[in-house]
Each structure stands twice: as C-alpha cells, then as structure tokens.
C-alpha cells in the first residue's frame, strides 16, 4: 500500500514510496515539508501560508543557517523550517493510527540538521529503519541554532528561545496533520540526543506543549544539564553586537540593529575556540535556551508538574564526557602523555568556581580517592572522563529522573545507561560509549550500512529500536510489537533502577543506584558548601573577539594550581556564565568524514554529535536515593557581585521578586503571577504563540535574568552553580 498525495494544512504533498523486499512492505517518505514560514531573524516562527498544487516532498531542504566546522563561512539557509516523515506501509491497506516519534537533533544548540551527516548515501537521522522495524511514523525537522536560534538580551527586546519555538511549531504541526499520514495525533513521542535530549526535556516542561506530547526520551541531555540554560544572555548578545557594529548601550536599539543585520554576519560573529583552551569548553558557548518567562516560564527544576502525564525515558552513555574531557585535557587520548594531579585539580577548580577553594578541594578529593590504590594513567584518565560525564550528563539526568518520578501522576519513568563501547580506532582501549555513540544504534545504522558494523552491533541496534518503539506505542519499553532481550523495570526513587544497554543483555542488565556516592556528593555535600563571595570568584572575560582565548585570571592562579594543602589561593575562575554546550569537533552532521572503525571494515561509524556543558544545579535531599530537588530555590544561591566591576549577579531562581519578561506573542499581557505554593498544578497552556501561559505555582518563579548594567562590562558574572 502507499499513501500517494496527502492533504495537509498547507496543501497537498507527495512523497516517494520505497519498496522493501519481496513481501510488499514499503515506506512512504516525505522530505522537506514546510511547517512554518521562512524565518525572520530573531523573530518567533510564523505559520506557513500554504501553497497551491501538490508539493513534491522528495528532497531534504537545507539546514538552518550555521557556521561551518572551520567557523570561517556559513552554510544552510534562513528558509529552513521543514520536516521529514517516514511512514511504514504493509502490503494491503495504508497504515492508520500509528505511534509517532519526533526526533530532535543535538549539536550544542549551535549546529545540526534534521537529516544529519550523509555517509554511504545514508543520512544519520534517516528514519527508515526505526519506522519499518518498529512500525512507527518517524518525523525529523530543522530548527534554528546558534545566535539566530538563541541570541537573547534577557528581556522583551530579544527574548530568545527562537529555536525552541521552532521545535514547538514542528510538534504542533505534527499534532494537527499527522493523522492524514496514518499517525495517531494522540500518541506523539519526542526523542533526541544531547542538545536534542535537553530540547525534548524542555518541550515537555513548556506550558506551550500542554496536550501535545504523550511520551519523551532524552538521550544524554536534559533540561537540568548545566549547559542548557544561559543565565547571562546579555553578555553574549553584546559580544555579537560589538562584532557586527551594533550599538550596545541600549538594549532596544541593539535589538533593532541585530534584527536587520545580515544573518550570515550574525552567525559568523560568534566563534567557539576548539584548541588551546584556557578553560573547559563549556564556558565558550553562549547561545542556548534562556528562562524567558513565557516559553520557559521558570527555572526548569520548577516546571516538572507540566510533565506529570508524560511517560519518560532518560539516560546517558557511560563515557558521555570523554569527548569533552579529551578537548579540555588532550593527554587523555594520548598514550605517551600523562594526566597529572595538577592538571586534574585545575580542571576541577574550573568547574567548581562558585564554591571556591573548598569546592575544588573536596571535589578533587572525592574523585581522586582511587588514585592511591591505582595510580595508573588509565585510572587517572578514566577519572577525568568520569568527572566530566558526571557533571555534564549523569548527575543532571539522575536529578531529572527523580523530578519526573516525584511529579508524575499516571506517567511512567525509565532510566538507562548505554555502555556499548565506542568504535573509534584512535581512542584508547579503555574508552566506553562516548557522547553520541548511541545515535547510530537507535537509527539502525548497523542494518542500513552493514559493512561498517559487526553482528554484535546489530544486536545492540535491534534491542534499542525495540525498546524505543515499544515505549512509543505503549509507554512501556517491554510491551509492543517488538521482542526485547530482557525486562526493563521502571525507575523509582526507591530503587533508582536502570537498564544497562550492552551487546549481551539479560536479567543482570537491570541495575540499581548508578554511581550513588558521586550523586550523593554533588546533590548533598557539594551543595552544602558555602558559596564564595567578592573577589574569591572574580571572572575575567575573554577580551576582544568572542572566539579569542580568554585572558587567564590574574593573581596566583595564573599558573596551573597544585592541589591545595591549606586554604590559600582561590582556584582559577572561568570566563563565562553558567551555560553553554561546546560543539563536538566532527559533529554527526558535519561533512567531515568520520574516522573508520576498527574491525575488518573500512566503513566508518557515526562520529559524535552533540554538546557539553557545565555542572548541574543539584537538589537538596538527605536520602540515599537520588534526592528530589525542592521546587523552590533550585540550587546554590547566586554568586554575589564581584566587587564593583561587574554586572549584577543573576537573581536567585527562588522568590526573587523580579518581574517576568512580558510574553512575546500577540498579547502584551504579562504572565499571570502564581498564587499559592502547590508543586503539582501544571502550568496552563497557550497555543502555538501569543497569549502568555501562567507560570507554575510554587515559591519560585525564576524571574528572567534582568539586563545587566551596560556601563559595567569589565567582568562576567560567575554563575556556574551546582
């Protein structure tokens, strides 16, 4: 059976029907359906006016405008809001009421596309294998990234989150139109990896999506990941404005100027250094989501009531931090180079600025405990990877799972750890599953391009597709049309159960309490440490171009610090605010050919895509299970002003009193302020745009970051918090 032309809200579309073997099964593929009008720079997406005749949806459209991997030119287009659909078909009737899976790509909110990299004439995010093996409809789409997707002044002049609103437009389009393709509009599952996983999480928390999403899967990224929310957007907006010659003294004038600046110039005005970094990569990425008081009405930690009815899977790769650790500390992948205590202490101190010397020392001590018994370089390098994995991915994911569970009504919660080792031959043998290694298995690459893979890789891929698509069908990864290798138990706050995904799976694959000691450390011990004040945490911003390596902090910490013996000398302070996700060198969707895998085939595996970040804001709590953070103040208090030289600190996300940014839709009315302190009343929705949602009740409205004082830009506020 095949669909032929399908009528959508924009008009008729016609795809391609691809036959699958001799049994008569096929897949209808639609590429390049517009889900919104061509974008205007730094404006919310608008509905597409439609077309006459039948749109031939046979080729992927260009990605959204972004810098190339070399960051010296751009590719993609401003007219980029298109989606792609794969519909599996049997021999006789056309499919009806199929579950729908919508993929959100990663790439640091800086790069990427709905189709991904092309290798062996097969795109990374080609939905065919998932669709046909799992009997689900797969949808992928483009959204704006980088400055065009996320530049914000932190107020109503440029509220930001344009890329998130693009994502929402795609989700809403699917809800309204997917029935015509044979999908069930009441059974939509979002899934995504890295910045895409965090986006999935944010979409479930946004009041704009109320009633649109049934289930969600976050792979290596959640809304609570420390690289997801930009707390000092004005700093980054000004960096770009200066570069393109816009005035920075007045936010309204700056915003108007930025809107009429050549989008390519805006894109190229922001560069991320990829080598010779003085600080961890996460400190250099500034264009990510913000708390705008509207689409993201409050700190994500306080929005979990909005996801109370959404089934949720979240997980990480066992060495998600490897790619970032190897950029921050290149010795990790070099057998002839050593990681020293000094190196690691310096890295730790850069992640723990807000807790000063004690934060650096206690964290260093916790992570190096095993070094006494095993001082081998392999153990030390694994420690560095574990540290970045914990901070950037694992701990925030555990907190997100605990929050989801604590707020869930009927919804189920599942956790996983993906441990099938990386196939990059240039990596040391001890490297496990690196960031983005999971994507190729979810998208069935071992089946689509078999020459690059081994039978064990197909086993992993088959299992992941089965769990993922069963979950999309029923909300339970064990139940559906696909057999699974072992039973995956739900996550509860009591058992902290998670499924370890490997090439050999059985009853022992169901495990409990992943890295509990480290989780407890970050959410209890570290959180309780006092936040440093005044000059103890005075960051020095990058000088000149935003891509320039920042000047290191002045004072004793210019040289690599040694582990402290007393309480002298504050650790070095990184240059930026608390957000950002570095790009991964060859990203999953760059054109650069990936390194071929080991084994007997020359076909490469999918290279890492994705992003990174900074430490999470942990909850308080006192039990052994991952503590559920309070719904009020979401973490450490904000860093106090650093002397008289910097902009004011980010207000606390608790009861700060600062008014929310007025909504950016048609309505000028501000969001309704909450009454009472209930944690579970979900935020009422609004539609695709316009009328503002009511922020959640509770004692934390997470007022959007106020614009920083234009006259004092000498230093950047240190707002990295756990």
């Amino acid at each position: 059976a095949k669909l032929g032309a399908v009528y959508t809200e924009g008009g008729f579309v016609e795809g391609v029907n691809k036959k699958l073997g001799l049994l008569g099964d096929s897949v209808d593929i639609f590429k390049g359906i517009p889900f919104a009008a061509p974008t205007k720079a730094l404006e919310n997406p608008q509905p597409h006016p439609g077309w006459q005749g039948t749109l031939k949806a046979k080729n992927f459209k260009k990605r959204c405008l972004q810098a190339t991997i070399t960051q010296d030119s751009t590719y993609g287009d401003e007219d980029c809001l298109y989606l792609n659909i794969w519909v599996p078909q049997g021999r006789k009737q056309v499919s009806r009421d199929l579950p729908v899976m919508i993929w959100i790509y990663g790439g640091a909110f800086l790069m990427g596309s709905g189709h991904g990299a092309n290798f062996l004439n097969n795109y990374l995010y080609d939905g065919e294998e998932i669709a046909t093996r799992g009997n689900v409809i797969v949808v992928t789409f483009n959204y704006r990234v980088g400055p065009l997707g996320f530049l914000s002044t932190g107020d109503a002049n440029l509220p930001g989150n344009y890329g998130l609103r693009d994502q929402h437009m795609a989700i809403a389009w699917v809800k309204r139109n997917i029935a015509a393709f044979g999908g069930d509009p009441n059974n939509i599952t979002l899934f995504g990896e890295s910045a895409g996983g965090a986006s999935v999480s944010l979409q479930t928390l946004s009041p704009y999506n109320k009633g649109l999403i049934r289930r969600a899967i976050s792979q290596s990224g959640v809304a609570l990941s420390p690289w997801v929310i930009q707390k000092n957007p004005l700093f980054w907006a000004k960096k770009v404005a200066e570069k393109v010659g816009c005035p920075v003294g007045d936010a309204a004038r700056m915003a108007q100027c930025l809107k009429v600046t050549d989008p390519r110039a805006l894109t190229l005005a922001y560069k991320v250094p990829l080598a010779g970094l003085e600080y961890p990569m996460l400190h250099y990425v500034g264009f990510v989501p913000v708390i705008d008081g509207d689409f993201i009405p409050a700190d994500p930690i306080n929005l979990y009531a909005n996801a109370a009815d959404i089934d949720y899977i979240a997980g990480t790769n066992n060495m998600d931090g490897h790619i970032f650790a190897s950029i921050d500390m290149p010795a990790i992948n070099k057998g002839n180079k050593k990681v020293t205590e000094e190196d690691f202490y310096k890295l730790v101190s850069e992640f723990t600025i807000t807790k000063g010397l004690r934060g650096a020392k206690t964290t260093f001590d916790v992570y190096t405990e095993s070094w006494a018994q095993d001082p081998s370089q392999e153990n030390k390098k694994k420690t560095v990877v574990d540290f970045e994995t914990d901070v950037l991915f694992l701990v925030p994911t555990e907190i997100a799972l605990a929050q989801h569970r604590a707020n869930a009504k009927s919804a189920k919660t599942y956790a996983y750890l993906f441990s099938h080792p990386s196939r990059m031959p240039v990596y040391p043998k001890w490297v496990g599953a690196d960031h983005a290694d999971d994507i190729q298995y979810v998208f069935g690459k071992p089946f689509a391009t078999p020459t690059g893979y081994r039978p064990q890789d197909r086993t992993v891929s088959k299992a992941m597709i089965a769990y993922w698509t069963n979950f999309a069908k029923t909300g339970d990864p064990n139940m559906g049309d696909s057999a699974v290798p072992t039973h995956w138990e739900p996550y509860t706050t009591e058992n902290s159960g998670y499924l370890e995904i490997t090439k050999k799976m059985g009853s022992s694959s169901m495990k409990r309490s992943l890295r509990t000691n480290f989780l407890r450390y970050w959410t209890l011990t570290y959180l309780a440490l006092p936040t440093v004040t005044d000059q103890e945490a005075t960051p020095v911003p990058p000088t000149g171009d935003s891509e320039a390596t920042p000047v290191p902090p002045t004072g004793d910490s210019e040289t690599a610090p040694v582990p402290p013996t007393g309480d002298s000398g504050a650790p070095p302070v990184p240059p930026t605010g608390d957000s950002g996700a570095p790009p991964v060198p060859p990203t999953g969707d760059s054109g650069a050919p990936p390194v071929p895998p080991t084994g007997d085939s020359g076909a490469p595996p999918v290279p890492p895509t994705g992003d990174s970040g900074a430490p999470p804001v942990p909850p308080t709590g006192d039990s052994g299970a991952p503590p559920v953070p309070p719904t009020g103040d979401s973490g450490a208090p904000p860093v106090p002003p650093t002397g008289d030289a910097g902009p004011p600190p980010v207000p606390p996300t608790g009861d700060s009193g600062a008014p929310p940014v007025p909504p950016t839709g048609d309505s000028g009315a501000p969001p309704v302020t909450p009454t009472g302190d209930s944690e579970t009343a979900p935020v009422p929705p609004t539609g695709d745009s316009g009328a503002p949602p009511v922020p959640p009740t509770g004692d934390s409205e997470a007022a959007p970051v106020p614009p920083t004082d234009d006259s004092k830009e000498a230093q950047m506020p240190a707002v990295i918090r756990f």
Partner: antibody, heavy 119, light 105 residues
Framework: QVQLVQSGAEVKKPGASVKVSCKAS????????MHWVRQAPGQGLEWMGV????????SYAQKFQGRVTMTRDTSTSTVYMELSSLRSEDTAVYYC????????????WGQGTLVTVSS | DIQMTQSPSSLSASVGDRVTITCRAS?????LNWYQQKPGKAPKLLIY???SLASGVPSRFSGSGSGTDFTLTISSLQPEDFATYYC????????FGQGTKLEIK
Amino acid sequence: QVQLVQSGAEVKKPGASVKVSCKASGYTFTSYNMHWVRQAPGQGLEWMGVINPGDGATSYAQKFQGRVTMTRDTSTSTVYMELSSLRSEDTAVYYCARDYYGSSPLGYWGQGTLVTVSS
Amino acid sequence: DIQMTQSPSSLSASVGDRVTITCRASPSISYLNWYQQKPGKAPKLLIYATSSLASGVPSRFSGSGSGTDFTLTISSLQPEDFATYYCQQRSSSPTFGQGTKLEIK
C-alpha cells in the same frame, strides 16, 4: 471574475448515489484546490474533502471515507462530488468552494446544491 | 479531529455596537478563518490567517488571537452585519465552529 456554478437540486432515495457538479470560470482551473462543504438544514458547516484539479489528488474527511468520490474534468473546468449509500441525514446543501490563496481559506463559493434524501 | 468551540451561540446587539465573537481550538492551531453567512446564501470569507481581511471586506471587521483563543470583532455594527458567523481551523482535516447567530436587539 471567479465564478463557481453548481448543478441543480436533487431528490434521492436512501441507498442511492448523487453526483453534484461545480463548473469553474474566471481563473486558471488547475491552479487552485477545490473543497466540498455541506450544510444540513439549520445546522453548521461540515468539510467533506478537497481535490487538486491539477493532478486529481484528493483527501476526504474521515467521516465520508469510502462513500465520497471527488473527480475533475480539466477540459470543462468542472469538479464533481459523488456521495453514495445515501441516508436521510445526508439531506443538506452541498457547496463547492475554492481556496482563496495558499491553502484552506475558502475564498470563493458556489451557490449550493440542495440534495434531499427521502423515501 | 481538532475541536472548534464558538461562543456565544447567539447574540443580540444594536446598530453601532461593538461585538466580539470568540472561537476556542483544542488543541492549538496555527491559523483561523472567519466566514459570514446570510440565510439562503453561501458563506463569505471575512478574515483569513487569523487577522487578514479578505478583499472587499469592510475594515470594521478584525480578527486576532493565537494558539487556542481567537476573536472576531465588529467595531461598529451595521444593519447588513446581522448574520451567522463561523470560524474554521486549517489542518489536514479542516473543521468549523458551530456558528454564532448575530441578531438585531
């Protein structure tokens, strides 16, 4: 100017079929989708389906799937709507309506055709 | 299917009055169209894409809203405006509201 002229009123017995025509003029026939909307006596408007006169592609509302067929004749710039297995509740005025621009705003309407289903 | 709920279902007003008719969509929609229908006549397009006036429609008619809540406003009622008004959503299966009958008080 755009004109849509529909065929005359019909009286049909339950179980029979009816075929209503809609002749278009004043614009390029194959460039705009044509929709069919019906209105039962004293009731609201109900969308039945749409045809692209350019390639004949159709889409029908779930409620009418299997009972309705929309066709076109480009040589006479006419679209047709046939409804089978008629029941008394199909008694209504049937309108053809052309897209205004883009998609979905129904900018130009025929005068309507009353179909009465009665035994 | 997307549900469209119009309110009120009927309304009495006088010439010169300002009148507002609302239409609520569930779930949210992208665009809304408004039509006017007089007894024994075919409907006539008034407003398309939420707020754009169809050609030949007087400027006293205006539309606004987004997401789930939309309004049609007639700023100063004229005798010829007494009719039934329908909203319509645009999706793969367009649906109309049940109509609002505007009568002379």
